[in-house]
């Protein structure tokens, strides 16, 4: 029986690629593919990297799990029963089919994917205690990694630009994080939801208190990372709020940094193109736009003061009385969906007051946010009992290899 153990690999030079949470051979069939294509694949963070062979250290493709919706088991066409080697990964804008060598390998892939996207060890897969232990280790690593990263729905935009983005591109999501504007380490959350037939934009303050982020709602909620902040908003609206995610294709557009002639600051510049602007969320079958079901879903908890939340000014910065009022966004033009144009960057410096951080790569290997999903498929358990002894031996071998 084929094993999920790693075949021998040429050691990778240090610093070339991060070690994978899990890796094995995997056959992949995307929405545009006629047939399955075999890769060596590794999961790291929220990205599956695909290599031509298990000796390569340069990936040829990668798949971001930021728009994860669910995993399902696949019964191959023409089959009457589930052979246990096919599964489907459903993202917000596409479905990818996978084929592996064994049922064990399939359950491992599903388990590790669910661990990183849901930040919990799945309990309803056919996995051994050793597998679950490995997943709990990965969970700890992923939580530590997330605590240090900025979610991809964090954009270096102003309050008005945030509202404008959510209004113009509802299909990309309806929640984004942005700088707070009070000069502190905090952030603001901008959301757009349907309320009584009108789209309403809301802004929430998230204050930095030591190592924690505190969401300023009626009962202030403390989070360990910005990622957790996003998860709070997603989960407290039963997924009515969807983190703003940009199209993978824009990663291919190269920008460059040049010094602003006026003040010497570095400014991120993307190649320009004519026309009204890009449509950043394209490709693959689309689910319903996030806005379509929002009026049926619960809003966030009430704010402490619908009129204003006061933020203590930091240093010489102006006092910003942060608004948590609703803003009905009614005066917007019809947006044409033009041909794709190069992507302006996430973080655009706007002098003259202070330089902004360096440009952010949206679909960088390790830096994506996800809408949390609780969709759990049912998995077959028959026929696995006789594998137990063999699996445990393999696990012991694997642990020995890794330590």
């Amino acid at each position: 029986m084929a094993s999920a153990l790693r075949p021998p690999r040429v050691p990778k030079p240090k610093g070339v690629l991060p070690s994978h949470y899990y890796e094995s051979f995997l056959e992949k069939k995307g929405p545009c593919d006629r047939d399955y294509k075999k890769f060596w694949a590794g999961l790291q963070g929220l990205t599956i990297y695909f290599y031509n062979s298990n000796r390569d250290f340069q990936h040829v493709e990668k798949l971001n799990l930021g728009a994860f919706e669910k995993l399902t088991d696949e019964i191959p066409w023409g089959s009457s029963r589930d052979p246990g080697t096919h599964f489907s990964l459903i993202l917000r804008d596409q479905e990818i089919k996978f084929k592996v060598e064994t049922l064990e390998c399939r359950e491992m892939w599903k388990g590790f994917i669910l661990t990183v996207v849901e930040l919990r060890v799945p309990t309803d897969l056919t996995l051994l205690p050793g597998h679950l232990y490995m997943m709990s280790e990965v969970l700890a690593k992923e939580e530590a990694r997330r605590a240090l990263e900025t979610p991809s729905c964090f954009l270096k935009v102003s309050r008005l630009e945030a509202q404008l983005l959510l209004e113009r591109y509802p299909e990309c999501g309806n929640l984004l994080l942005r700088p707070s504007g009070d000069g502190a380490d905090g952030v603001s959350v901008t959301t757009r939801q349907m309320h009584n037939g009108t789209h309403v934009v809301r802004h929430y303050k998230v204050k930095r208190e030591g190592p924690k982020y505190v969401i300023d709602v009626e009962q202030p909620f403390s989070c360990t990372s910005l990622d957790a902040v996003v998860n709070y908003f997603v989960s407290h609206t039963k997924k009515a709020l969807v983190p703003f995610l940009l199209d993978e294709d824009y990663e291919k557009v190269l920008g460059y940094v040049e010094a602003d002639k006026e003040n010497g600051e570095n400014v991120w510049v993307a190649p320009s193109a004519p026309g009204p602007g890009p449509a950043p969320c394209t490709g693959g079958p689309k689910p319903l736009s996030p806005a379509s079901s929002q009026d049926k879903l619960p809003p966030l908890p009430p704010l402490p003061n619908q009129e204003e939340n006061y933020v203590t000014p930091i240093g010489d910065g102006p006092a910003v009385d942060y608004e948590n009022q609703d803003v009905a966004s009614s005066s917007w033009p019809v947006i044409l969906k033009p041909k794709k144009l190069p992507k302006p960057p996430a973080k655009l410096p706007k002098p003259p007051v202070g330089p902004k951080p360096e440009p952010k790569v949206f679909n960088g290997g390790l830096g994506r946010k996800l809408p949390v999903s609780s969709a759990q498929p049912l998995f077959p358990t028959a026929g696995l009992a006789d594998m137990t002894a063999e699996l445990q031996k393999k696990l012991e071998k694997r642990r020995a290899l890794e330590h």
């Epitope: 954009l155 935009v157 102003s158 309050r159 008005l160 630009e161 509202q163 404008l164 983005l165 209004e167 113009r168 591109y169 942005r178 700088p179 707070s180 504007g181 000069g183 603001s188 934009v201 040049e258 602003d260 002639k261 006026e262 400014v267 991120w268 510049v269 993307a270 320009s272 009204p276 602007g277 890009p278 950043p280 009129e307 204003e308 010489d316 910065g317 102006p318 006092a319 910003v320 009385d321 942060y322 608004e323 009022q325 803003v327 966004s329 005066s331 917007w332 033009p333 144009l341 992507k343 302006p344 655009l348 410096p349 706007k350 002098p351 003259p352 007051v353 202070g354 330089p355 902004k356």
Partner: antibody
């Protein structure tokens, strides 16, 4: 030195069209949102339209929605305002203005640089 | 739309006077308010952003205050070059709106 230079204004009949241009120099044009603000003779300032640096999101005043189109060409450092179905009440000096976000100390926008304006007269 | 109302619409004062112009928003706009100065035949010039922050290069005799719906622009000691029209503008939400202006004239 930051400079904004409007052009394209002139006399046009009601129902006619004009295209205003604003040539920007002295700063990295692609990194800033931009806007058009107009001022009818002897009147106050009226915001007309804005275009974001970020994905070129656009917004319009109700009075011009459906008739005016704002656009930009970053390769030419130029902002445009296509004005169709012009009316007498569109007669004004049209200013191009740079919108900036004040960095870490504030998340609002303000027009920090303005062009000298171009006069559009709609009359039969 | 958010309406911005300035008062007074015109004001006569002398060099050295302390002058205050007020601006009221039809709904709370937090501190998303800017003040501009415009002289005849010229483009407007940004004086104050975020209700109270002085734009670079603007003399310190200009100051702004307020939050929510009520804002003031104060010129502590009028200089001859300050006689102009002053506008407030909200950047809380689109459409961006200006006050009708306050014309400051020499007494």
């Amino acid at each position: 030195e930051v400079q904004l230079l409007e052009s394209g204004g002139g006399l046009v009949q009601p129902g006619g069209s004009l295209r205003l241009s604003c040539a920007a120099s002295g700063f990295t044009f692609s990194g800033y949102s931009m806007g058009w603000v107009r001022q009818a003779p002897g009147k106050g300032l009226e915001w007309v339209s804005g275009i974001s640096s970020y994905y070129y999101g656009t917004s319009y005043a109700d009075s011009v929605k459906g008739r005016f189109t704002i656009s930009r060409d970053n390769s030419k450092n130029t902002l445009y305002l296509q004005m169709n179905s012009l009316r007498a009440e569109d007669t004004a000096v049209y200013y191009c203005a740079r919108s900036w976000t004040v960095g870490s100390s504030w998340d609002g926008d303000a027009f920090d640089y303005w062009g000298q304006g171009t006069l559009v007269t709609v009359s039969s | 739309d958010i309406q911005m109302t300035q008062s007074p619409s015109s004001l006569s004062a002398s060099v050295g006077d302390r002058v205050t112009i007020t601006c009221r928003a039809s709904q709370s706009i937090s501190s998303y308010l800017n003040w501009y100065q415009q002289k005849p035949g010229k483009a407007p010039k940004l004086l104050i952003y975020a209700a109270s922050s002085l734009q670079s290069g603007v003399p310190s005799r200009f100051s702004g205050s307020g939050s929510g719906t009520d804002f003031t622009l104060t010129i502590s000691s009028l200089q001859p070059e300050d006689f102009a029209t002053y506008y407030c503008q909200q950047s809380y939400w689109y459409p961006l709106t200006f006050g009708q202006g306050t014309k400051l004239e020499i007494k």
